[in-house]
């Protein structure tokens, strides 16, 4: 589609006569009638195929004519067609008089032509004007002429189509052959494919309008080029997406557990030495004079129970001091005066002489100890239970309660992590002592396989003619876009040509 | 345990600003990114704004671009919200979350009412 | 903006019922979808990422199930302190988006 231009410049009849060499009364009123044709070898009147145009009487026997002359006419002359411009063409250019205001052929008499030039050649299209001049016996016309594409259309015969736009469907302008110019920060065969961020990831980020840098799930950062760590997470970082790597002195699958409290919470008072035993457990050691868990209370030398055989403890300023009961002496009234004959056993206790009746000794039954079976045996005194289970005495036994994670009479078993099946679609939970590790079928990563991993469909470039390959994440399969003038699944059929 | 607790909200006059705070304990705030949710009165949640965890990268709701500004100050555990220009179509429960545009909001603060009205 | 909607807006149930609410993105959001539950006066709840991982600490009764657009969330066995309001939410697009919720309550 474009426009033949004719600008008229200058038409000389300086007698005023018409073709037939009559004279004009008063003057020869000129208007001119113009043909555009196809070529011919030779002009012939016919059909103005390629259009026909007017003008209103522009002046009188000799005038110059101006740019878009008045009297409603335009210069240049304007015939438009809508066809891809064949490259040649015939024109030609009637000049009139006119002796009434009625310019319609019909209203004019066959002799009141001035003048007929034809011409015929090649024309290419461009901005340049083409300079003529034709000469009658009488009469002189000078012209210009040249064709130009119509808005939007360009290329050598006007037949590409091309209407600048800065939308979703393109962000471009029209290069003079009527190739695409993408508007800065956009790319692609229609300039739909916004440049990211200098340095935005590849992988990891994209964009939706040029100089953005959008990060997928699991990925953060100007550049998207950092991972986010697992939601659970507590005092962990990364180096893949939804990882949890603890930071020292935590532990546990979301490094949640202390393994430094005695660092972090300073627990033991009184000046006790700290040990780190384990998940948020810990040991004081006391110094002398105190006790309790964090080493909280102030020992009494006779809260360690020293007088045996019955003996009452008295405190005193430089230690302390056991009443003996009857029969008994020593420090810790641990000697006796006593025989078997006294019956000195308690609690079922059998009597046993030593040093020719001098002494005896007491066998305890179960669940009583003492020289004189006296106490009560605490089943919890030689700390039985492990993982910092607590012992609890009952009756003649006694129990561990474990804390979580631990099981087993004396809690000396680690409950599996696995057991709560923690790994996600489809993945081999594997207990470790650091905790558990998912093996991930394919398609899926993560601490518990809960990122999907998309597979690459696009990567044996399955779409032809330049199609541009999408993966359907949801079915790991490619999506072939067709450019223009293809079909099929794979873009691999020009439009019009189906499958044999 | 995770602890997100929000301070300064109010109330306060059309075009006027306002600065919350949330601090931030129970794990290693330096680690994530972290974000602010809102709730109108009796309505749903909106996401507002978001910032990464080291190199500070921020992103916003279209509505609140050029007048709202999050920043955050690893060393006092603490995220904010800077709110300038506020409209009363800002007025909301504000929410300071752990959490990404591109991720869920694992943890969430109790929410501090800002009331825009004049 | 990927639009979320939610179905039903409200729901009356029963302690020990099934309850299933939807969820439907305007677009593929593949499996980036979070629920979360809100009690009046109180913060939302993380209870499901990933369209179906349970949050630490969530009961077992709870699950989460689809992809692409459409996504549930079930309560096998309703307990009273699940009575509250539900969102989901799309963590695919920019900017993130929430359902406008649905209010579950007892019959």
């Known amino acids: 589609s474009g426009v033949f231009q004719l600008q008229l410049q200058e038409f000389v009849n300086e007698r005023g006569v018409l073709a037939s060499g009559r004279p004009c009364e008063p003057g020869c009123r000129t208007f001119f009638r113009v043909c555009l044709k196809h070529f011919q070898a030779v002009v012939s009147p016919g059909p103005c195929t390629f259009g026909s145009v007017s003008t209103p009487v522009l002046g009188t026997n000799s005038f110059a004519v101006r740019d878009d002359s008045s009297g409603g006419g335009r210069n240049p002359l304007q015939l438009p067609f809508n066809f891809t411009w064949p490259g040649t063409f015939s024109l030609i250019i009637e000049a009139w008089h006119a002796p009434g205001d009625d310019l319609r052929p019909e209203a004019l008499p066959p002799d009141a032509l001035i003048s007929k030039i034809a011409i015929q050649g090649s024309l290419a299209v461009g901005q340049n004007w083409l300079l003529d001049e034709q000469t009658s016996t009488l009469t002189r016309l000078r012209y210009s002429y040249r064709v130009i594409c119509s808005d939007n259309y360009y290329g050598d015969n006007c037949s590409r189509l091309c209407k600048k736009r800065n939308d979703h469907f393109g962000h471009y302008v029209c290069q003079p052959d009527g190739n695409l110019s993408c508007l800065p920060g956009w790319t692609g065969e229609y300039c739909q494919q916004p440049i990211c961020l200098s340095g935005c990831h590849e992988q990891n980020g994209y964009c939706s309008k040029p100089a953005e840098c959008l990060c997928r799930p699991g990925w953060q950062g100007r550049l998207c080029n950092e991972c986010i760590p697992h939601n659970g997470c507590r005092h962990g970082t990364c180096s893949t997406p939804w990882q949890c790597t603890c930071d020292e002195g935590w532990g546990g699958l979301f490094c949640d557990q202390d393994l430094n409290y005695c660092t972090h919470h300073s627990p033991c008072k009184n000046g006790a030495t700290c040990s780190n035993s384990g998940q948020r457990s810990y040991t004081c050691t006391c110094r002398p004079g105190y006790t309790g868990v964090d080493c909280e209370l102030e020992l009494s030398e006779c809260d360690s129970n020293p007088c045996r055989n019955g003996g009452s403890c008295k405190d005193q300023e430089d230690g302390y001091h056991c009443l003996c009961p009857p029969g008994y002496y020593g420090l810790h009234c641990e000697h006796s005066t006593l025989s078997c004959a006294d019956s000195p056993c308690f609690n079922g206790g059998s009597c046993r002489e030593r040093n020719q009746g001098a002494s005896y000794a007491c066998e305890c039954p179960p669940n009583f100890t003492g020289s004189n079976c006296e106490k009560k045996v605490d089943r919890c005194t030689s700390n039985p239970c492990a993982n910092g289970g607590q012992c609890l005495n009952r009756g003649p036994s006694r129990m561990c309660r474990c804390r979580p994670g631990f099981t087993g009479t004396y809690c000396e078993r680690h409950v599996s992590d696995c057991a709560r099946n923690p790994c996600a679609h489809g993945g081999t939970c594997h207990d470790l002592e650091s905790g558990l590790m998912c093996t991930c079928p394919a398609g899926f990563s993560g601490r518990r396989c809960e990122v999907r991993t998309s597979i690459d469909a696009c990567a044996s470039s399955p779409c032809f003619n330049r199609a541009t390959c999408y993966t359907d994440l949801s079915t790991d399969t490619f999506v072939c876009n067709c450019p223009y003038g293809f079909v099929g699944s794979r873009c691999e059929f020009p439009v019009g040509l189906p499958p044999s | 345990e995770v602890q997100l607790v929000e301070s300064g909200g109010g109330l306060v006059q059309p075009g006027g600003s306002l600065r919350l705070s949330c601090a931030a304990s129970g794990f290693t705030f330096s680690n994530f990114p972290m974000a602010w949710v809102r709730q109108a009165p009796g309505k749903g949640l909106e996401w507002v704004a978001t910032i990464s965890s080291s190199d500070g990268t921020t992103y916003y709701r279209d509505s609140v671009k050029g007048r709202f500004t999050i920043s955050r100050d690893n060393a006092k555990n603490s995220l904010y919200l800077q709110m300038n220009s506020l409209r009363a179509e800002d007025t909301a429960v504000y929410y300071c979350a752990r959490g990404y545009y591109n991720s869920p909001f694992a943890y969430w603060g109790q929410g501090t009412l800002v009331t825009v009205s004049s | 903006d990927i639009q979320m909607t939610q179905s039903p807006s409200s729901l009356s149930a029963s302690v020990g019922d099934r309850v299933t609410i939807t969820c439907r993105a305007s677009?593929?959001?593949?499996?980036?979808l979070a629920w979360y539950q809100q009690k009046p006066g109180k913060a939302p709840k993380l209870l499901i990422f990933d369209t179906n991982i349970l949050a630490d600490g969530v009961p077992s009764r709870f699950s989460g199930s689809g992809s692409g657009t459409d996504f549930t969330l079930t309560i096998s066995s309703l307990q009273p302190e699940d009575f509250a309001t539900y969102f989901c939410q799309q963590y695919d697009y920019v900017p993130p988006t929430f359902g406008q919720g649905t209010k579950l309550e007892i019959k």
């Open positions: 677009q593929d959001i593949y499996y980036n």
